[in-house]
């Protein structure tokens, strides 16, 4: 059988607002007082098994004791009333769980959405945490009819159980209730049709046009509640490799439609499209984006001719020369399609033309010593580019006019080249460049620059601490001008090794030192100067600095009959490197001198 408790705590289910005061009372039963020989002054209050300080306890009468808590902050406290039976044995009388929290805030930001094909979902901001069990109920009604309540599981949203009825306004609000209070949100009044989020458009397809290489035609299927809604669209696109989307102006897609032509695109370029929709009034929510679909614009003829240049091979005969016509593959943005071949037309000054069709990017021809005009066009399946024209003068003609003030300098990890144009109008410039090495030939790469350019950088990721030889040639209508060259480094470093010094001549009081220039492969930069350090085994070290143009130096004021140790270092702008140490001994007597 259940034992009757010796007393009770009131209130039995205490819930307290945080920060407020709270008083509980424990009332002992008469029978209990007699059985244990106690009264209310024997009561010990405990919170979470710890005794409450005496100053918080008041004995009201022989059966009743109260306890008061100020500024309650703990979320949950086990409060027990205990007696000291027979004055010493502590016995539990009754216990309650005291909860603390806040009354619900008025819910705000109530919004509802009708996901197409689903029931209406409403969401709100419940405000601050209550720390108590709080029930949120979504209420909705027409002017004449209430709908079933929606009990929220999470306290921030609820999906109603009924299908929405369109074109009739409903009123929606949220009620929040817990042990400390009850509150309602402001109500919102709307037609569910203005809260629809359509399903994304589907079956998006992209087709190109043979007539126009700058357009792609899109078509798709929209749902719009099975045709109940008129939808407007939002179309975005990007090139296949781009990460940012380009927006079709929304004013162009305002009217309900299931197709659209996107214009001003680049030829022979793959584009990716996506589309979403919303009620044409703009009310409601944008659908999620459709699945992406891609298409490629039709080819157009190449928009410009390739860069075009030539090299004359060393010739053995006198009447003919071997000429290598060379050109660059057009970048995709200018090729506008797949380049099928190149058409080269060679015209001798006084005779008929010869046409060559070439699939590669160079053509070697044997030419007489006459002047020739070469033209080059790139061809794709739509047509040919404009022609690049190059005059190949007779080898007997001396090139006049070159660029002046040619300079090269590194900046932002690029090697820049600049020059002053010649005084005669230029068609274009050709830059040729290669890494100088004593172990390999200077095989040039080249690039073409427009006539308006007088500053550019070498294209491609250049090597550091390698010496580049750069040649700039202006090209005129009559043929190439004179070439100007210089050497430059993208980034210098200290030399890989220092000079190896030797003696050329040793006298009693002087020695002529000689050394070879460091090979260009080991220079790692411009050699600015040398230092020569020399010392005897006991004397202090002497250092002299020598200009980089020298390959010998005379040490003077040396002691006779003395062993000298010599070492040379070479310096670039980025530091120096010592060569090996060398020793020599001065003679005791000068030539012809006797003791």
């Amino acid at each position: 059988q259940l034992l009757e408790p010796c007393g009770y705590i009131y209130p039995e289910f205490p819930v307290v607002q945080r920060g407020s005061n709270f008083t509980a009372i424990c009332v002992l039963k008469e029978a209990c007082l007699q059985h244990y020989y106690v009264n209310a002054s024997y009561i010990v209050w405990k919170t979470n098994h710890a005794a409450v300080p005496r100053e918080q306890v008041t004995v009201i009468n022989r059966t009743t004791s109260s306890v008061t808590f100020t500024d309650v902050v703990l979320p949950s406290v086990q409060l027990t009333c205990n007696i000291l039976s027979f004055g010493q044995i502590e016995q539990n009388v009754y216990g309650v769980t005291m909860l603390s929290g806040f009354p619900p805030d008025k819910p705000t930001n109530l919004t509802c959405i009708v996901n197409e094909g689903k029931n209406m979902l409403c969401q709100w901001d419940p405000g601050r945490e209550t720390y108590l069990e709080t029930n949120y109920t979504l209420k909705s009604e027409w002017a004449t009819e209430k709908f079933p309540d929606c009990q929220s599981k999470h306290g921030t949203s609820c999906m109603v159980s009924y299908m929405p009825t369109y074109y009739v306004n409903i009123e929606v609000w949220v009620e929040a209730e817990n042990a400390l209070g009850k509150v309602s949100s402001e109500s919102i009044n709307f037609d569910p049709v203005d809260k629809v989020k359509p399903t994304p458009p589907y079956n998006l397809s992209v087709t190109n046009s043979e007539e126009l290489s700058s357009i792609l035609k899109l078509s798709w299927v929209s749902s719009g509640l099975g045709g109940l809604l008129d939808l407007k669209s939002d179309i975005q696109y990007r090139t296949k490799d781009a990460s940012t989307w380009i927006q079709v102006p929304l004013e162009d897609t305002m009217s309900p439609r299931t197709s659209f032509t996107v214009q001003d695109l680049k030829p022979f370029t793959e584009y990716v499209f996506r589309i979403r929709s919303i009620k044409d009034s703009g009310k409601g929510y944008w659908s999620d984006w459709s699945e992406e679909a891609s298409g490629t614009t039709y080819e157009d003829r190449p928009s410009r001719p390739p860069s075009f240049w030539y090299k004359t091979n060393p010739s053995h005969g006198q009447e003919y020369r071997s000429v290598r016509l060379i050109w660059k593959a057009l970048p995709l943005s200018e090729a506008n399609g797949k380049i099928l071949d190149y058409e080269v037309i060679l015209t001798q000054s006084k005779s008929v033309s010869q046409t060559y069709t070439v699939t590669g990017t160079e053509l070697t021809v044997n030419l007489t010593n006459d002047r020739y005009v070469a033209s080059l066009a790139a061809r794709n399946k739509v047509g040919k580019s404009a022609a690049a024209v190059l005059t190949i003068p007779s080898p007997h003609v001396t090139a006049a006019y070159s660029v002046v003030n040619l300079k090269a300098f590194p900046k932002d990890n690029l090697l820049w080249v600049e020059w002053t144009p010649p005084p005669k109008p230029v068609s274009k410039y050709i830059l040729e460049w290669c890494v100088l090495s004593e172990n390999a030939p200077c095989v040039e790469d080249w690039q073409q620059e427009d006539a308006t350019v007088n500053r550019t950088h070498l294209r491609g990721r250049l090597l550091e601490s390698k010496c580049y030889q750069i040649t700039v040639t202006p090209v005129f209508a009559t043929g190439p001008g004179g070439s100007e060259s210089l050497k430059a480094y993208l980034k210098q470093a200290a030399p890989a090794r220092g000079p190896t010094v030797r003696t050329k001549k040793v006298g009693k009081n002087e020695a002529v030192l000689a050394w070879d220039q460091i090979p260009v492969d080991d220079q790692n930069g411009f050699i600015r100067n040398y230092s020569i350090s020399y010392r005897t085994s006991v004397g202090k070290e002497m250092v002299v600095h020598v200009d980089s143009s020298h390959t010998e130096y005379t040490l003077s004021s040396l002691s006779s009959d003395t062993l000298y140790m010599v070492r040379m270092a070479a310096y670039t702008d980025e530091g120096g490197k010592d060569g090996p140490e060398f020793t020599f001994t001065t003679p005791k007597f000068a030539q012809g001198e006797i003791e």
């Epitope: 660059k328 593959a329 970048p331 590669g360 790469d445 491609g460 990721r461 090597l463």
Partner: nanobody
Framework: QVQLQESGGGLVQPGGSLRLSCAVS????????MKWVRQAPGKGLEWVSS????????YYADSVKGRFTISRDNTKNTLYLQMNSLKTEDTAVYYC???????RGQGTQVTVSS
């Protein structure tokens, strides 16, 4: 990003042949001169052969002239080195690289041994 991947190396007897390939991606292959270099065990890098961007001009080290042939297929973005009459001193790791740029492959081992 730029990638150069050599293949075709292996073990061959003196007098034998091998054809090395280098597949290139990430830059406009036909616009740049290319080269083969090699590194024998315990030695520095040695230039072997070069070819112009269009393939019309080729260059060889004296040690391989008449035995090796460099070529390129710009439609396939691939560089080749045909190696005939191989000698033991051709044993090395062979690398393909852009002639004047900081692009180089990981290398392929060629071992000539009886």
């Amino acid at each position: 990003q730029v990638q150069l991947q050599e293949s075709g190396g292996g073990l061959v007897q003196p007098g034998g042949s091998l054809r090395l390939s280098c597949a290139v991606s990430g830059f406009t292959f036909s616009n740049y001169a290319m080269k083969w270099v090699r590194q024998a065990p315990g030695k520095g890098l040695e230039w072997v052969s070069s070819i112009s961007g269009g393939g019309g001009a080729t260059y060889y080290a004296d040690s391989v002239k008449g035995r090796f042939t460099i070529s390129r297929d710009n439609t396939k973005n691939t560089l080749y080195l045909q190696m005939n009459s191989l000698k033991t001193e051709d044993t090395a790791v062979y690398y393909c690289a852009a002639q004047n740029l900081d692009y180089r492959g990981q290398g392929t081992q060629v071992t000539v041994s009886s």
